[in-house]
């Protein structure tokens, strides 16, 4: 319900008796307010007083009416000013004036805390003429007050040039508390202290702060807004919450868990992305973090053959993005992989364990002890060669490939021959005399070919030489070796 | 809260700064003002700081003191030639209002324990 | 500026009794008036605000009344605690300018 208070008819200052066109008590009220603003109408209302300070806000006409009595100066009449009511009530305030006739088109604009309030406001100004003046009454209504409506209110006319300013009216909107920072959720080591935070104005102020704990007050007195609360240190999860109090009731701030720091839970779900001969791609899903970051994880392997002697490698790794490559391993090998992740209090147990394998490689080492012989009868080079160590191989050996080079004056010429697996010598014809053939030999597996031996070198006299010396891959640190005939 | 500090015995015509520091309360939304109380004597209102870093003075205060917020926690009463008449405990108080206007109803809801301010030869 | 009058300077009363203290203001604030009670070396309490609005946590016995030049502080039912300083203070401001004013003080002494 809204309550009206009325202004009474007052002579208006500097005009000889009363003032022409003074409201009736069936005009439009000048203040309305809900009966909950604590307010004493009948003390709220005086008229203008002449002589105040805060110019600005009269204008002096320099016009004179027809019997040349001068205008008094133009000012808003006194309202009241410092409303104070509940969120969600109607009020209704207003500024009046009185306008000599002498001027037309005055309109009057409201404005809220320095900026004009335009559109979808209740704002209705109502004029009543007379002889002489017109009263003039701007009324502003809110149905339902909210705290954005807080703030000074202003009228403004303007009028020949002039700007007349009313007194300020400031809506006081008064409300349950209002939280401006409420506790947040932590993740907190065992048994250390931390702080939580709470914070909720009015008005009403002052407003009180309770404490709640797993749906149990904390604090048996109060405490003035903001507050902090010094928790010494839980040994389990816990869920805190703060009331604000006021005059006008109690608001409750969201719930918050407060979780103790723990070491993760191991990594599931560790999975082969991708195999090579000396490398396996590995991803893995996280664990819970103990809420705790993760800082990093370690990757464990283990040769999986039972006759290995069981040592364990360790790659570490950052815990993003769930994804690593192990490298340095051997070719056509089964490993054993497990993955644990840390946090700041400590690291996982490991995840399961898989098993892994690496691919066929090319072999990583070169046939060795190769030799290279002329065969003039046949017209032949024998090649002879020891295959590499097995555990070099990295898979199984397929064959060698042979390259040959036959240089003589000017001219160059390589010849690729494949041969298999069986055995370790070959025979290839000579393709030019007097001339030098180089020789190189690769081991080769499904995973590819090997790396080339050392060239070794033979000269190809013309027809009618004979050759009964061999040529060998030279010892190591000989670079180029040629054999003279 | 609010705690002013700074208060000493100085020198006649000697400048002075009081410092007001406040905690739990943002100066961005609040006005905070100056009171002083000469011994055994009234309140006095010098001036205040409007959340938006508007100053008001009272009249006889023009000239003689400026206030001036120095960080989002303190607020500076410099009192800047200080005769004997300005021997008083100086308080700081913070407006009723939050909003960041340059004017509004300004009294004061909180206040300082005060700091006392002794000028002498 | 505005000037704030407060009467009487001094004012003496049973337990139990009613002190009335007046102010007034030298134009017109219309209810931009608080009172605030202050014991010795203590900062100023803010009792009413709005002229009759009583601040939270203070008693009903504290009464603000008046609107415009004159305002009246009542106290009834005086009590031992209630023996302080007493003063008005007018917060009246413009779109331009804030007037900020108290007044001289009432001293209540119970008896």
């Known amino acids: 319900a809204i309550t009206e208070a009325r202004e009474e008819a007052k002579p208006y200052p500097l005009f000889p008796g009363p003032f022409p066109g003074s409201l009736q008590t069936d005009h439009t009220p000048l203040l309305s307010l809900p009966h909950a603003s604590g307010y004493q109408p009948a003390l709220m209302f005086s008229p203008t007083q002449p002589g105040r300070p805060h110019t600005g806000n009269v204008a002096i006409p320099q016009v004179t009416s027809v019997e040349s009595k001068p205008l008094p100066p133009l000012a808003f009449k006194h309202t009241v000013g410092h409303i104070i009511l509940s969120e969600h009530k109607g009020v209704k305030f207003n500024c009046s004036i009185s306008v000599p006739n002498i001027y037309q088109d005055t309109t009057i604009s409201w404005w809220k805390d320095g900026k004009e309030l335009l559109g979808a406001h209740h704002a209705i100004t109502q004029f009543y003429p007379d002889d002489e003046v017109t009263a003039i009454i701007a009324s502003f209504s809110i149905t339902s007050v909210q705290r954005s409506d807080n703030g000074s209110y202003i009228c403004k006319m303007k009028i020949n040039n002039e700007e007349i300013v009313s007194d300020p009216i400031y809506i006081e909107v008064q409300g349950l508390p209002h939280f401006t920072k409420q506790p947040e959720s932590m993740n907190v080591t065992r048994n250390t202290a931390f702080n939580l935070t709470c914070q909720a104005v009015g008005p009403p102020e002052p407003v009180n702060i309770f404490w709640v704990q797993n749906s149990s007050r904390v604090n048996e007195q109060p405490e003035k807004s903001p507050s902090v609360l010094t928790v010494p240190g839980l040994t389990e999860m816990a869920v805190f919450s703060c009331e604000a109090h006021n005059d006008k009731g109690l608001t409750v701030s969201k719930g918050v868990q407060i979780n103790i720091k723990a070491i993760p839970s191991p990594p599931t779900e560790v999975s082969i992305r991708n195999s090579t001969a000396h490398s396996i791609l590995i991803s893995w899903v996280p664990g819970f973090d103990g809420y705790s970051p993760f800082r990093n994880c370690s990757i464990q392997v283990k040769e999986a053959d039972p006759l290995s002697n069981g040592s364990v490698m360790i790659f570490n790794t950052s815990a993003l993005p769930h994804l690593y490559q192990i490298k340095q391993l051997q070719a056509l090998a089964n490993y054993s992989i497990g993955v644990s992740c840390m946090n700041e209090i400590g690291w996982s147990a490991v995840s399961p364990w898989i098993l892994a394998s690496t691919t066929e490689g090319a072999p990583s080492v070169a046939p060795l002890n190769v030799t290279v012989f002329l065969n003039e009868s046949s017209d032949n080079v024998d090649i002879r060669w020891m295959k590499p160590p097995t555990k070099q191989q990295d898979g199984e050996l397929v064959g060698y490939r042979i390259s040959h080079v036959w240089q003589s004056a000017g001219i160059s010429k390589e010849l690729l021959e494949e041969v298999g697996q069986n055995g370790s010598r070959a025979r290839i014809s000579v393709q030019v005399h007097n001339a030098t053939c180089t020789v190189r030999i690769a081991a080769v597996t499904r995973g590819g070919v090997g790396p080339f031996s050392d060239p070794v070198k033979i000269f190809i006299p013309a027809h009618g030489w004979v050759d009964y010396a061999p040529s060998s891959t030279p010892a190591p640190g000989n670079a180029d070796p040629v054999l003279i005939i | 809260s609010l705690e002013e500090s700074g208060g000493r015995l100085v020198t006649p015509g000697t400048p002075l700064t009081l410092t007001c520091t406040v905690s739990?309360?943002?100066?961005?939304?609040?006005?905070l003002g100056w009171v002083r109380q000469a011994p055994g004597k009234g309140l006095e209102y010098i001036g205040i700081?409007?959340?938006?870093?508007?100053t008001y003075y009272a009249t006889w205060a023009k000239g003689r003191f400026t206030i001036s917020k120095t960080s989002s926690t303190t607020v500076d009463l410099k009192i800047t030639g200080p005769t004997t008449e300005d021997t008083a405990t100086y308080f700081c108080?913070?407006?009723?209002?939050?909003?960041?206007?340059?004017?509004?109803?300004?009294?004061?809801?909180?206040w300082g324990p005060g700091t006392l301010v002794t000028i002498s030869l | 500026d505005i000037v704030m009058t407060q009467t009487p300077a001094s004012v003496e009363a049973a337990v139990g009794g009613t002190v009335t203290i007046k102010c007034q203001a030298s134009?017109?604030?219309?209810?931009?008036l608080a009172w605030y009670q202050q014991k010795p070396g203590q900062p100023p309490k803010v009792l009413i605000y709005?002229?009759?609005h009583l601040a939270s946590g203070v008693p009903s016995r504290f009464k603000g009344s008046g609107s415009g030049t004159q305002f009246t502080l009542t106290i009834s039912d005086l009590e031992c605690a209630d023996a302080a300083t007493y003063y008005c203070?007018?917060?009246?401001?413009?779109?331009?300018?804030?007037?900020?004013?108290f007044g001289g003080g009432t001293e209540v002494v119970v008896r």
């Open positions: 108080a913070r407006g009723a209002y939050a909003g960041y206007v340059a004017f509004g109803p300004y009294y004061f809801h909180i």
């Open positions: 739990g309360i943002d100066l961005s939304s609040y006005a």
């Open positions: 700081i409007s959340s938006t870093g508007t």
């Open positions: 134009q017109s604030i219309s209810n931009f």
């Open positions: 709005a002229a009759s």
């Open positions: 203070q007018s917060y009246f401001y413009s779109s331009t300018s804030i007037y900020n004013a």
